[in-house]
């Protein structure tokens, strides 16, 4: 299931202690996502059929509206805050894609499965990032921004927005995995 649209309100009172070696776990989750990002991208554009597989640059280029910035040379705190925003953006966008694909490509079960598995890792990553921000920097809430809502778009636009998002996801997750 997709990430909740509104992140849980946190008061920076951690009910459970953060996981041991939290930064290592964050790195591991990013590596996991990076390792499967290209396969997810290929699975997606293949499932959409023509004209997607032969027009990747045009239809699946990573030009995404209002995507949160990331500065790899920032402090740990700044990178974690920016990572959190990116994960929320990706998570909600992935939720939209999953919803659309279940209707547009109901038989693409391996795609649905991979989208759900990615969303699960993103959820765990989100929890770990907030735990780190809370325990080390006293930041219990990060204000976020969301991607474009695909409901109300036509079939082609839904497929294209999804492909662009996954192209961006593949690109940014490599940067994030390297930065941490």
């Amino acid at each position: 299931s997709p990430l909740p649209i509104t992140p849980v309100n946190a008061t920076c009172a951690i009910r459970h202690p953060c996981h041991n070696n939290l930064m290592n776990q964050i790195r591991s989750q990013l590596a996991q996502l990076n390792g499967s990002a290209n396969a997810l991208f290929i699975l997606y554009y293949t499932a959409q059929g023509e004209p997607f597989p032969n027009n990747l640059d045009k239809l699946c280029g990573p030009n995404v509206t209002d995507f949160p910035p990331f500065h790899a040379n920032g402090t740990e705190k700044a990178k974690l805050v920016e990572l959190y925003r990116i994960v929320v953006y990706l998570g909600t966008s992935l939720g939209n894609i999953t919803r659309d694909q279940k209707i547009l490509n109901p038989s693409a079960l391996s795609l649905h499965s991979k989208l759900n598995a990615t969303a699960d890792i993103l959820r765990g990553l989100l929890s770990n990032v907030l735990c780190r921000l809370c325990s080390k920097y006293h930041v219990g809430h990060v204000d976020v921004t969301y991607g474009p809502d695909t409901s109300g778009k036509d079939v082609f636009q839904k497929k294209k927005l999804g492909c662009q998002l996954l192209g961006k996801y593949k690109q940014i997750i490599a940067v994030l995995a390297q930065a941490f």
């Epitope: 705190k77 006293h138 204000d143 976020v144 969301y146």
Partner: antibody, heavy 120, light 108 residues
Framework: EQLEESVGDLVKPGASLTLTCTAS?????????MCWVRQAPGKGLEWIAC????????TYYATWAKGRFTISKTSSTTVTLQMTSLTVADTATYFC?????????????WGPGTLVTVSS | ELVMTQTPASVSEPVGGTVTINCQAS??????LVWYQQKSGQPPKLLIY???MLASGVPSRFKGSGSGTQFTLTISDLECADGATYYC??????????????FGGGTE
């Protein structure tokens, strides 16, 4: 990149007033906190409110400002501060400021300020 | 509610000297602290962010340090142009309804 507050006013106690902050050289598609800070004559700085420019439009207020002050994003380059039930104690220079999206960033960009005088 | 206490309220030092301004937070704020300089009739100017990071265009004579509840701004090799009021400020969102955004009382 610049911020400019609308011209302040002389108003009577109990009156309402809306201040506007206009950004130039940038828009709110960047992720910032747009905030209002005031300074009574000869006194220190006092935070009033902030609004997040991301799609959630989250708002935050100083405890004393809740209920009487309202911050709003009215376009991709303007933020307003509505003030009601004004008292003499609200006489101050009101500054609009842009805060960074990361904790500890602070306000790197300020408007020149506008004087609001509340007097009978 | 968080209180930021700044000391001293005023300080005077000769040109070339060094000044130290202290800021104490009533609770642990990690490194989420900012320092500003304000001259008469002007808006404040950001000097230091994240407790110790020098803002763009600020000379290295200005140094911020500290973490948790105790913070210091040190200005060395004082110049006449440094005559101003200095403010510390906490800056972070502690929860979805609480932006910790308080200023110290200022040091002239």
């Amino acid at each position: 990149e610049q911020l400019e507050e609308s011209v302040g006013d002389l108003v009577k106690p109990g009156a309402s007033l809306t201040l506007t902050c206009t950004a130039s050289g940038f828009s709110f598609s960047g992720l910032y906190y747009m905030c209002w800070v005031r300074q009574a004559p000869g006194k220190g700085l006092e935070w009033i409110a902030c609004i997040w420019t991301g799609s959630t439009d989250s708002t935050y207020y100083a405890t004393w400002a809740k209920g009487r002050f309202t911050i709003s994003k009215t376009s991709s380059t303007t933020v307003t501060l509505q003030m009601t039930s004004l008292t003499v104690a609200d006489t101050a220079t009101y500054f609009c400021a842009r805060g960074g999206g990361v904790p500890g960033d602070g306000y790197a960009l300020w408007g020149p300020g506008t004087l609001v005088t509340v007097s009978s | 509610e968080l209180v930021m206490t700044q000391t001293p309220a005023s300080v005077s030092e000769p040109v070339g000297g060094t000044v130290t301004i202290n800021c104490q937070a009533s609770e642990d704020i990690s490194s989420n602290l900012v320092w500003y300089q304000q001259k008469s009739g002007q808006p404040p100017k950001l000097l230091i962010y994240d407790a110790s990071m020098l803002a763009s265009g600020v000379p290295s004579r200005f140094k911020g340090s500290g973490s948790g509840t105790q913070f210091t701004l040190t200005i060395s090799d004082l110049e006449c142009a440094d005559g101003a009021t200095y403010y510390c400020q906490s800056y972070y969102v502690a929860s979805s309804s609480y932006f910790v955004n308080g200023f110290g009382g200022g040091t002239e």
